[in-house]
């Protein structure tokens, strides 16, 4: 895999503790689940549950596993080759333009609008104008009707970081 994981903290410098397996680089790079030694001669395994690497690399450190924030559930744990997958709790969602936090879904649509999409871990409820069918911008309305959203949909990752 050639995906680059961005904005991840580095794990502390790894000095090849005895339990960390070593192997030789292949064509100068190390496989997923490893990082390269300072002299470039060895591949050192990442530590399960602590750090990871997702692709062939010449990283000097494995990448530190993400810890799910409060308000998030862990969909899958961190392995040596994949970061933790976190998802917003039911009734909350994470927007692309504010990925750092889960926000509460609205409980209903403004007057003159109808709900066409439920609250999911990655989107608020979706409202459209009754007549025109155009989408609502997403601001929380001053007055809400009694139309309410159903709880979040079944588990599906909203921000895959690995």
């Amino acid at each position: 895999e050639s995906a680059l994981i961005t904005q991840q903290d580095l794990a502390p410098q790894q000095r090849a503790a005895p339990q960390q397996k070593r192997s030789s680089p292949s064509e100068g790079l190390c496989p997923p689940g490893h990082h390269i030694s300072e002299d470039g001669r060895d591949c050192i395994s990442c530590k399960y549950g602590q750090d990871y690497s997702t692709h062939w690399n010449d990283l000097l450190f494995c990448l530190r596993c993400t810890r799910c924030d409060s308000g998030e559930v862990e969909l899958s744990p961190c392995t040596t080759t994949r970061n933790t997958v976190c998802q917003c709790e039911e009734g909350t969602f994470r927007e692309e333009d504010s990925p750092e936090m889960c926000r509460k879904c609205r409980t209903g649509c403004p007057r003159g609008m109808v709900k066409v999409g439920d609250c999911t871990p990655w989107s608020d409820i979706e409202c459209v104008h009754k007549e025109s069918g155009t989408k609502h911008s997403g601001e929380v309305p001053a007055v809400e009707e009694t139309v309410t959203s159903s709880p979040g949909t079944p588990a599906s990752p909203c921000s895959l970081s690995g």
């Epitope: 502390p12 292949s26 470039g40 010449d58 450190f61």
Partner: antibody
């Protein structure tokens, strides 16, 4: 003497494609991990792609992933960068670069080739 | 990504001056820092790697120091050929560069 000579740059429209080449000499090309690094008009340097010495493994930053492909022909001592879906922000001087022995960073760079993405 | 904050962005100095350029990493990078010199229209040239090791042929007036997050490039006595742009780079996690320092003649 290590020599890296890039070619293939030019003016291309947004959404267009371009293939850069880098001819290597003065060292055993097939033994080295190679990369492309670019320098924007504002002089900022950005790593673009890396390929293993034998060409089997590659990796990229998110900014170019899925649009750029690095490859090499060790028989011809040549490194390539295939660029597609080009954007204005891809405008830069593109350098091919060699990863040094036992230092895990770039020790030699080519002179660069200018890619301008504009309509 | 690890951000490398380089300062100053430019400086004016005279031949014989001692010049210091600093780079601050947004997180610990150990000693995985390199320094490059670039002259107009030319490729960057490696000066220092592993924070303090001089590359082959680099004069000993160039000295690198630091570890963790704070790094320094010092030119002990500036020579006419040293007026150029200088960049730091971390290579512990992928590759990111500082914004550069332009060393100009006073």
């Amino acid at each position: 003497e290590v020599m890296l000579v890039e070619s293939g740059g030019g003016l291309v429209q947004p959404g267009g494609s371009l293939r850069l080449s880098c001819a290597a000499s003065g060292f055993t090309f097939s033994s080295y991990v190679m990369s492309w690094v670019r320098q924007t008009p504002e002089k900022r340097l950005e790593w673009v792609a890396t390929i293993s010495s034998g060409g089997s493994y590659t990796y990229y930053p998110d900014s170019v992933k899925g649009r750029f492909t690095i490859s090499r022909d060790n028989a011809k001592n040549t490194l390539y960068l295939q660029m597609s879906s080009l954007r204005a922000e891809d405008t830069a001087v593109y350098y091919c670069a060699r990863r040094g022995d036992s230092m895990i960073t770039t020790d030699y760079w080519g002179q660069g080739t200018l890619v301008t993405v504009s309509s | 990504d690890i951000v490398m904050t380089q300062s100053p962005s430019s400086l004016s100095a005279s031949v014989g001056d001692r010049v210091t350029i600093t780079c601050k990493a947004s997180q610990d990078v150990g000693t995985a820092v390199a320094w490059y010199q670039q002259k107009p229209g030319k490729a960057p040239k490696l000066l220092i790697y592993w924070a303090s090791t001089r590359h082959t042929g680099v004069p000993d007036r160039f000295t690198g120091s630091g570890s963790g997050t704070d790094f320094t490039l010092t030119i002990s006595s500036l020579q006419p050929e040293d007026f150029a742009d200088y960049f730091c780079q971390q290579y512990s996690s992928y590759r990111t560069f500082g914004g550069g320092t332009k060393v100009e003649i006073k």
